[in-house]
Interface confidence: low
């Protein structure tokens, strides 16, 4: 399937002009490479009418060209001063021949239609409504006025000002006068449709005096915007619709053969196929609202339809919005795993990928909640503080540069299963979504921590060892101490694990931390974990509390930290850089202005990085050490 | 940053002119049609004049033609309107648009970005 993409089918009238926007994958060889403009003929032959090698034809002198925009993935043919002989096959399409890479365009130019010298035109969206005007002389003000619509052998009334209403109209049409002009009667059409488009007549009075008006009323529907992504990245629906359906239940569909199968809705509908990857957003008062796809999949390219009805549903009459949307399989993003799997009382690393282009940006983990429109309460951030709920069990570990990083979650318990989404507050289509299934255990963990219930005493030394199997010997492993801006890693030295050994004894296995001497800042969580260069793997929490010497421990240690309510948080995800697309000089606020934190971004994010140096001034030293023990029986 | 700079604006009699021009930057001004539209107190925003990118094609409302005449200059980067005959119902706010290109000259969904507007009021 080519990678190519642009409008499938492009219509205009005689004398009128176009522009064919065509996009391509994101690669310098795509940048630079020559695109072209080709009509296709009955032979197959794809005959070249304008490149960017700067190759003009014959029939395209003067009023054409064809400009390409590196910086945004796409080139844009414009022909102006169309005729009938334009209508045909076209490909737009990159490579030094035209049997490169390529899109088919069909390209339909009609006549312009014949209408009556004194005809006005009116040219409105689906949806909308038109306010007919038609003038009358002084002598016709008392007499009937009414508006028809032609047909082809009559002209069929709509409405007249003594009340009688073509059924097709009740409700829509109204035929009123404004103020005291009696020169100029109006008539108002709302819910406008296809079937409304065509030649009307107004009338005041009758017979040879009457006064007659011809109207031609266009009937559009909305143009699809087109929307090139890549897999697995996202996509934002913008959807402007007005302030007539602000208070209306809004909706977003994908056409399907003759119908529009609701996506996700304002009441609560959503296509389980879309479930944790999709949010709905409210925008204003003013009819706006968006709707983000992460998790992009081959089968989501189609053509999608925005409305409100209060319903929820898509309904004739009523305003929409259009786009047709290409999903890209020459992806930049990395292939990850969307499934993880843990066990309850263990823990999960998650890989989270971003544009490494963006490596200051700041990163965030969110988890998708289903209720309402759906949203994503950021639960940890590179500059965003842990949520109080997962104290002690979850952190982010940023690796700057290398377009990961990972976000590990320990001590899970059946409730954490869900969906999570990774984004950062650059390039919002490397937003990822992550699917945790947590099953119960059925066997010992990977790492244990002796002692479990750990209360050390002030100023005395205090040490607590990490077990793990034989198969991380080769890992490193590592403590850290937990706070809610992240898990410090404390220094480590490796004590025998590097020495060469025949057997590993599973029974032996152990990294150790020592606490000399024990202070009150002691207090807290504490991470034992493997990792694989700056690839995270599994681990384990614990609790130390630290008691005075001379009196029992008042401390009440947290022998669950799962047990904890959970808090129902109402804020959602903030993303100052979502909006996709301003449609506006005057810029439009981000679609998800009313959120929480992310807004007050520096340029520079301040970075939460793991970091090693964790010894402190008063001489207190903090180790841990791996051990590899020999026993003799 | 597309932005649209709209001038010209002020009272003038019926009858009388006034050429009201556009300051477009941050866009590929060449490619796109450009388009004015207006909005009168309590109406609706409705299209005046649109042209072509390269100048070849232009559309009039019926209510403007053979009294007003768009133009542009792609070196200068600017669009014109040059409004002759005013009448008193010609009075609103004159918004300069940039074009979709999405072959709709005179519908407002055709224009994605506006400038804020400069005021022509005719008196009688």
């Known amino acids: 399937k080519s990678p190519i993409f642009g409008p499938q089918e492009v219509s205009s009238i005689e004398g009128d002009s176009v522009s064919i926007t065509c996009y391509y994958p994101d690669t310098s060889v795509n940048r630079h490479t020559r695109k072209y403009w080709c009509r296709q003929g009955a032979s197959g032959m794809c005959t070249t009418l304008i490149s960017s090698n700067g190759y003009l034809s014959k029939e395209y002198s003067g009023r054409a060209n064809l400009i390409n925009f590196p910086e945004n993935n796409t080139f844009v043919i414009n022909i102006e001063q169309l005729t009938q002989d334009d209508t045909g096959s076209y490909k737009c399409g990159l490579g030094t021949s035209n049997r490169g890479l390529s899109f088919d365009v069909s390209l339909e130019v009609s006549q312009v239609p014949e209408l009556p010298s004194d005809t006005h035109v009116y040219t409105k969206d689906i949806g909308r409504n038109v306010t007919i005007e038609c003038p009358f002389k002084r002598e016709n003000a008392p007499s009937k006025k009414s508006l028809c619509k032609k047909t082809n052998q009559s002209c069929e009334l709509v409405i007249d000002s003594t009340e009688k209403v073509n059924p097709s109209y009740i409700g829509r049409a109204k035929l009123f006068m404004k103020g005291t002009d009696l020169t100029v009667f109006y008539v108002n059409i709302s819910h406008l449709t296809h079937n409304d488009a065509g030649l009307y007549i107004c009338q005041a009075g009758e017979g040879p005096s009457a006064d007659k008006k011809n109207v031609d009323l266009q009937v559009l529907a909305p143009e699809p915007e087109l929307l090139y992504k890549d897999l697995r990245s996202s996509v934002t629906f913008e959807c402007d619709l007005g302030r007539e359906v602000a208070n209306e239940a809004k909706y977003l569909c994908r056409m399907n053969k003759e119908t529009c199968d609701v996506i996700i809705n304002t009441l609560g509908k959503r296509d389980p196929d879309f479930e944790g990857r999709i949010l709905i957003t409210p925008k204003d008062d003013n009819g706006r609202f968006s709707v983000l796809i992460t998790g992009l999949r081959k089968e989501d390219a189609g053509h999608y339809q925005c409305g409100a009805h209060s319903s929820g549903l898509p309904q004739e009459g009523w305003p929409i919005q259009t786009w047709q949307l290409f999903v890209n399989e020459e992806s930049t993003i990395p292939n990850r795993r969307s499934v993880v799997k843990g066990v309850t009382g263990g823990s999960v690393a998650i890989a989270c990928p971003y544009n490494p282009k963006e490596s200051s940006s700041l990163k965030y983990w969110c988890r998708w909640e289903g209720d309402g429109n759906g949203h994503c309460p950021v639960l940890v951030g590179t500059q965003a503080q842990v949520q109080e709920e997962y104290e002690g069990r979850l952190a982010l570990f940023d690796q700057p540069g290398n377009g990961t990083y990972t976000v590990i979650l320990n001590q899970l318990t059946t409730e954490d299963a869900g969906f999570y989404w990774c984004l950062t507050n650059g390039d919002s289509r490397w937003r990822t979504t992550i699917e945790l299934q947590v099953a119960e255990a059925t066997r010992e963990p990977n790492l244990e921590v002796t002692p479990q219930n750990a209360t050390a005493v002030l100023g005395e030394t205090f040490t607590v060892s990490c077990h793990y199997p034989c198969k991380f010997y080769s890992q490193e492993k590592y403590w850290c101490k937990w706070s809610n801006k992240g898990c410090h890693i404390l220094p480590s030295h490796d004590e025998g694990a590097r020495q060469s050994s025949v057997s590993c004894d599973q029974s032996s296995q152990l990294v150790s931390m020592t606490l000399n001497p024990v202070s009150k800042e002691d207090e807290g969580w504490y991470w034992c974990g493997v990792k694989q260069g700056q690839t995270y793997g599994e681990t384990t929490a614990i609790y130390i509390a630290v008691e005075e010497r001379t009196r029992g421990s008042s401390h009440v240690n947290p022998t669950d930290a799962n047990a904890r309510a959970k808090v129902a948080l109402e804020e959602e995800v903030v993303d100052s850089s979502i909006s996709e697309k301003e449609n506006k000089a005057i810029p439009n606020p981000g679609p998800f202005a009313n959120e929480r934190e992310i807004q007050n971004v520096g340029d520079q994010a301040q970075e939460n990085r793991a970091s090693g140096d964790a010894g402190s001034a008063d001489g207190q030293s903090r180790s841990s050490s791996s051990k590899h023990h020999h026993h003799h029986h | 940053q597309v932005q649209l700079v709209e001038s010209g604006g002020g009272l003038v009699q019926t009858g009388g002119s006034l050429r009201l021009s556009c300051a477009a930057s941050?866009?590929?001004?060449?490619?796109?049609?450009m388009g004015w539209f207006r909005q009168a107190p309590g109406k609706e925003r409705e299209f005046v004049a649109a042209?072509?990118?390269?100048?070849?094609?232009?559309w009039y409302a019926d209510s403007v033609k053979g009294r007003f005449t768009i133009s542009r200059d792609n070196a200068k980067t600017m669009v014109y309107l040059q409004m002759n005959g005013l009448k008193p119902e010609d009075t609103a706010v004159y918004y300069c648009?940039?074009?979709?290109?999405?072959?709709?000259?005179?519908?407002?969904?055709?224009?994605?970005?506006w400038g804020q507007g400069t005021l022509v009021t005719v008196s009688s």
């Open positions: 941050g866009l590929t001004f060449s490619s796109y049609t």
């Open positions: 042209i072509s990118w390269g100048g070849a094609s232009t």
């Open positions: 648009a940039k074009g979709r290109n999405n072959g709709y000259a005179t519908a407002v969904r055709a224009y994605d970005y």
